[in-house]
């Protein structure tokens, strides 16, 4: 029975050309984390596995930072980067568990955090 | 089998600058962090920055910029920190330790730093 | 940045006793809490990950526990090895930052 929740940064903005930190938690559960897979709609970001540590998928490698811990950070934003991004988390014996973030790229200089929601 | 090797006890000068390595074997080194942890005698732990090998992306302690310089060669699978201008508060057991996002699971012999004219 | 504070600083215990471990941070850090053993001029050594999780070839004797700004180690029926300092560290958010340490000495 899958009883962890993931609660991630929510709807979030900032500045282009600018960075942001996308983070995910996962709680309630004592099931292992084994790897975690970011991803911005269908794109394979970075992968952070237990045993090999991370992948930054070739087309992000000069624009993705991985950290701080299993979280991932965007660098030089571009308006193109809004959209949805995904962390999904492997995890044994429990299986997958998944969270939403929503990232939107401003021109201006006014970029405000979103509130935290949780996933189940 | 991983294995992070640290070069050897230094003593340097006040105002001198050390440099010092952190070898690793048994794993992709440009897939993990590698951090740098300050130790002074009977004292506790203190982050001073790690280092991305595959980006070469650095993240600093505020504390200890202008002071320590993180560096990596991923062609001979070594981290390198520098100090400068130092002084008796940089006398330490200074770690090179390696993460993956999963805590520092594997840890240098540490590298003994003592400053003294 | 995130200040985690260890108590108690030192834990006088006899072999055989059980004992918990506080660390508390200044903000919530959801369960990115790591604990590490050191013995006298060793390296440190990482025990458990994410406030739970096991390490393998760690003794099973070694169990954590906490989320948000409370976490604590367990230690069942300390042996004489376990003996030496205690570190909790955060990598919720730059920069990583250690607890000032649990000394655990026999009695």
């Known amino acids: 029975m899958m009883t962890g929740t993931i609660e991630t940064t929510g709807n979030i903005s900032a500045e282009k050309g600018g960075s942001i930190i996308l983070q995910c938690h996962l709680s309630s559960t004592t099931a292992q984390v084994t790897q975690v897979n970011w991803e911005q709609q269908d794109q394979l970001l970075a992968i952070c596995n237990a045993d090999l540590g991370w992948h930054i998928s070739p087309s992000f490698k000069d624009r993705v930072a991985p950290g701080p811990g299993l979280g991932l950070t965007l660098q030089s934003l571009t308006v193109n980067d809004t959209g949805e991004y995904f962390c999904i988390y492997h995890t044994y014996p429990d299986g997958t568990y998944t969270g939403r973030i929503f990232l939107e790229v401003l021109e201006s200089s006014v970029a405000e955090h979103g509130a935290r929601f949780q996933i189940p | 089998e991983v294995q992070l090797q640290q070069s050897g006890t230094v003593l340097a000068r006040p105002g001198a600058s050390v440099k010092m390595s952190c070898k690793t074997s048994g794993y992709s080194f440009t897939s993990y962090w590698m951090h740098w942890v300050k130790q002074r005698p009977g004292q506790g732990l203190e982050w001073i920055g790690g280092i991305y090998p595959g980006n070469s992306d650095t993240t600093y302690n505020q504390k200890f910029k202008g002071k320590a310089k993180l560096t990596a060669v991923t062609s001979a699978s070594t981290a390198y920190m520098e100090l400068s201008s130092l002084t008796n508060e940089d006398s330490a057991v200074y770690y090179c330790?390696?993460?993956?996002?999963?805590?520092?699971?594997?840890w240098g012999q540490g590298t003994s730093v003592t400053v003294s004219s | 940045d995130i200040v985690l504070t260890q108590s108690p600083a030192t834990l006088s215990v006899t072999p055989g006793d059980s004992v918990s471990l506080s660390c508390r941070a200044s903000q919530s850090i959801y369960n990115n809490l790591h604990w590490y053993q050191q013995k006298s001029h060793e390296s440190p050594r990482l025990l458990i990950k994410f406030s739970s999780q096991s390490i393998s070839g760690i003794p099973s004797r070694f169990s954590g526990s906490g989320s948000g700004t409370d976490f604590t180690l367990n230690i069942n029926s300390v042996e004489t090895e376990d003996f030496g300092m205690y570190f909790c560290q955060q990598s919720n958010s730059w920069p990583y930052t250690f607890g000032g340490g649990t000394k655990l000495e026999i009695k």
């Open positions: 330790t390696r993460e993956g996002g999963y805590g520092m699971d594997y």
